[in-house]
């Protein structure tokens, strides 16, 4: 089943998930400039069996120059800021190490993805935290989330970690040296 | 907690337009295409058409397309459907729903009589 | 357009009852299909995604199946509160489009 929300948010952190359950969304979203296909499903899916899970569905981007853009829209302020264009997998290293049962991989990279994507979770999901760039992280307790099922609503365990001071940033589990990226993970990373 | 909060019902003239309005809230508006759907008894659901308000990107059903307009103001998280020349055929409730995970509004009834 | 067909209009069905109620695709759509319930004066509440996958607080009895043009929502012993209509959809092809539902009654 989906999770109701997202992963709590962790002042000067962000996470991400090593692999993702079957049933996971990962919405098909464009850069600024490009809009998804019309044909084809509007997000992919983690599905497959307990011995192979795979990404269904391939997202696909086209330039949205020669489309009627509505002029009424007014961005939000921190969609005029230049966004930066990180490479999708350049940091995803971990990702292409595991391979879990029931779980999928992290998706390739699609052209004109947007920078940031947008992950939709179901319950057993775990995703890890870790401090960004010029924070410490002090641990109380795992630093990690879990999407539960309790009473017949979904939750979010809350993560053991407060982010402080200035230091490296802290590892995900499995990662031999800290992430070079100046903002920790790459947002693309994340989800919300 | 996704919420979709459309404007009330309308009752409206022949030949005139109306703008229906859909509040989004729980979520991040610019980041989810949003759709709108019409019902009418005895014709079932009919989609009208999406808008991604990130971009302002739209897409119309090419049966809808002159009678609906899409747009959106992020600054309040609203989308809105305008529709125009209307009549009797127009009558019906108009749902607004994130495109995915799915999530709709209460809908809003249009009737179009002189 | 992409023609999403339920054949049976009503079904009738008791408490405790399993129900299986389909919807046929006029051409493939894969695994893109979702299935809704609407009760009377609501909006449609989404039940299943991707044909076989539950939102979060549908109940288990609810179970879609198929894939390519073949579609089934199961409803495994029925309760008085799923006495409702229940739309499937495609969302393969654009413009995205609908059964034209399939009303559940209780005996």
């Known amino acids: 089943e989906l999770c109701d929300d997202d992963p709590p948010k962790i002042t000067h952190a962000t996470f991400k998930a090593v692999a993702y359950k079957e049933g996971t969304m990962l919405n098909c979203e464009c850069k600024r400039g490009f809009r998804r296909i019309k044909s084809g499903s509007p997000y992919m899916l983690c599905t497959g069996n307990s011995s192979h899970s795979s990404w269904d569905n391939q997202c696909q981007c086209t330039s949205s120059a020669a489309r009627n853009t509505t002029k009424q829209v007014t961005p939000q302020p921190e969609e005029q800021k230049e966004r930066k264009t990180t490479e999708m997998q350049s940091q995803m290293q971990l990702a292409d190490q595991v391979s879990l049962p029931g779980h999928c991989r992290e998706p390739p990279p699609w052209e004109n993805e947007a920078t940031e994507r947008i992950y939709h979770f179901v319950v057993g999901q775990t995703v890890y935290y870790q401090c960004v760039q010029g924070y410490r992280a002090l641990h109380r307790g795992p630093a990690e989330s879990v999407c539960k099922m309790t009473h017949g609503k979904t939750r979010w365990t809350q993560p053991q970690l407060i982010c402080t001071g200035e230091t490296e940033p802290s590892q995900f589990p499995g990662e031999e040296e800290p992430q070079a990226s100046p903002d920790g993970l790459p947002e693309s990373e994340t989800s919300r | 907690q996704v919420q979709l909060q459309q404007s009330g019902a309308e009752l409206v003239r022949p030949g005139t337009s109306v703008k229906i309005s859909c509040k989004a809230s729980?979520?991040?508006?610019?980041?989810?295409?949003l759709g709108w759907i019409k019902q009418r008894p005895g014709h079932g659901l009919e989609w009208i058409g999406d808008?991604?308000?990130?971009?302002?990107?739209?897409n119309y059903n090419e049966k809808f397309k002159g009678k609906a307009t899409l747009t959106a103001d992020t600054s309040s998280s609203t989308a809105y459907m305008q529709l125009s020349s209307l009549t009797s055929e127009d009558s019906a409730v108009y749902f607004c729903?994130?495109?995915?995970?799915?999530?709709w509004g209460q809908g809003t009834s249009l009737t179009v009589s002189s | 357009d992409i023609q999403m067909t339920q054949s049976q209009k009503f079904m009738s069905t008791s408490v405790g009852d399993r129900v299986s109620v389909t919807c046929k695709a006029s051409?493939?759509?894969?695994?893109?299909v979702a299935w809704y319930q609407q009760k009377p004066g609501q909006s449609p509440k989404a039940l299943i995604y991707?044909?076989?996958y539950r939102y979060s607080g549908v109940p288990d009895r609810f179970t879609g199946s198929g894939s390519g043009t073949d579609f089934t929502l199961t409803i495994s012993n029925v309760q008085s509160e799923d006495l409702a209509e229940y739309f499937c959809?495609?969302?393969?092809?654009?413009?995205?489009?609908f059964g034209g539902g399939t009303k559940l009654e209780i005996k």
């Open positions: 729903a994130r495109v995915t995970p799915a999530s």
């Open positions: 729980g979520y991040t508006f610019t980041n989810y295409w």
């Open positions: 808008i991604y308000p990130g971009g302002g990107y739209t």
């Open positions: 051409q493939n759509v894969g695994t893109n």
């Open positions: 991707s044909a076989s």
């Open positions: 959809q495609q969302y393969n092809s654009y413009p995205y489009t």
